[in-house]
Amino acid sequence: ELCDDDPPEIPHATFKAMAYKEGTMLNCECKRGFRRIKSGSLYMLCTGNSSHSSWDNQCQCTSSATRNTTKQVTPQPEEQKERKTTEMQSPMQPVDQASLPGHCREPPPWENEATERIYHFVVGQMVYYQCVQGYRALHRGPAESVCKMTHGKTRWTQPQLICTGEMETSQFPGEEKPQASPEGRPESETSCLVTTTDFQIQTEMAATMETSIFTTEYQ
């Protein structure tokens, strides 16, 4: 089931999926001056079985000025562009995305692809947020959003992330700068990580991270 909306927008933050659930679609978009080849795929699709997941279809772009040539392209890693859901330098990589069953890795770039990737996420997808450069999070730990099905409708849970701007107090020399974290609700030390609530889904991905919001006090 596709999620109806995009993940929530958080001021001064970006999100990234560490892995993509089977059923996720990625539009084959080309940069200005280029177009999809005739009979080329409209999208890539994450598919797989219990042991392996991969992206079906290949995105291919050709010059808009070229009518007759259909050049088969191979991914050019050095041409990786800045995208809405990529390029996060997060110190909290959950687990190797390849080790998460039923999920695909970030697809490699294709030649002349658009600068922003447009994904169509499915229910159960989790994305992680981080403050953009120049902003810092008020709290420590991961901020995530999950696409959930509730009462027959899809919705994304709201990440509790606040990214603050210029500091009023200077950084002390040698003090480590804080990274992305949720403007969340304190987790009781006695709360149990295996508890699943309407607002928290435990996955293999999240299990390796400090869970710091939606505590048992509120379950």
């Epitope: 001021p11 999070a137 008020l138 420590r140 974290s181 987790e187 009781s188």
Partner: antibody
Framework: EVQLLESGGGLVQPGGSLRLSCAAS????????MHWVRQAPGKGLEWVSV????????YYADSVKGRFTISRDNSKNTLYLQMNSLRAEDTAVYYC???????WGQGTLVTVSS | QSVLTQPPSASGTPGQRVTISCTGS?????????VHWYQQLPGTAPKLLIY???ERPSGVPDRFSGSKSGTSASLAISGLRSEDEADYYC???????????FGGGTKLTVL
């Protein structure tokens, strides 16, 4: 159970100083930014200050800037508010709060009067 | 003067539905920050009632609901009860202040 317990309030003369403390328990204190919020008698809530989880940055309401200092000791699970040059208009119940903020202490009354 | 604007009072009879509004600006609610609502019973500390615009902590009855649109938000209380008589505050982060801002509070009276 999450608990926040403020202390240090009392009667002080204008121009005087007080140091409030907030002892936290029941959650991972060192992972959360903490707030001080105050409420003057019969009035609404007014945010005073916030400190990041590691204490590396702090922000203040304009009304207290330069007079109040927020700090924390993560090894003691304690939040502080040093209040100097107190004025009559600082009279209020001072709450420490964690998170959204969603957990609040019961508050400590600060009265500034001659 | 509070940064977020709420009506100072609201009232209703038991069983009625009451709505409390909260209006902000482009530096807080309009900037995309979540709105939170607090209930403060007489003589007690504020208690989180709604967080992230429309989420309820467990233990809060589903008679309470929140919504947000543009630079404003609202709290709705349906099936009003006498124990709902309290002060209600909205709050949101404000990036120009680098801190949360509160509404002036709405005193709800159950007639």
């Amino acid at each position: 159970e999450v608990q926040l317990l403020e202390s240090g309030g009392g009667l002080v003369q204008p121009g005087g100083s007080l140091r409030l403390s907030c002892a936290a328990s029941g959650f991972t204190f060192s992972s959360y930014g903490m707030h001080w919020v105050r409420q003057a008698p019969g009035k609404g809530l007014e945010w005073v200050s916030v400190i990041s989880y590691d204490g590396s940055y702090k922000y203040y309401a304009d009304s207290v800037k330069g007079r109040f200092t927020i700090s924390r000791d993560n090894s003691k699970n304690t939040l502080y508010l040093q209040m100097n040059s107190l004025r009559a208009e600082d009279t209020a119940v001072y709450y420490c709060a964690a998170g959204v903020p969603d957990y609040w202490g019961q508050g400590t009354l600060v009265t500034v009067s001659s | 003067q509070s940064v977020l604007t709420q009506p100072p009072s609201a009232s209703g009879t038991p069983g009625q539905r009451v709505t409390i509004s909260c209006t902000g600006s482009s530096s807080n609610i309009g900037a995309g920050y979540d709105v939170h609502w607090y209930q403060q019973l007489p003589g007690t500390a504020p208690k989180l009632l709604i967080y992230s615009n429309n989420e309820r902590p467990s233990g809060v009855p589903d008679r309470f609901s929140g919504s947000k649109s543009g630079t404003s938000a609202s709290l709705a209380i349906s099936g009003l009860r006498s124990e709902d008589e309290a002060d209600y505050y909205c709050a949101a982060w404000d990036h120009s202040l680098n801190g949360p801002v509160f509404g002036g509070g709405t005193k709800l009276t159950v007639l």
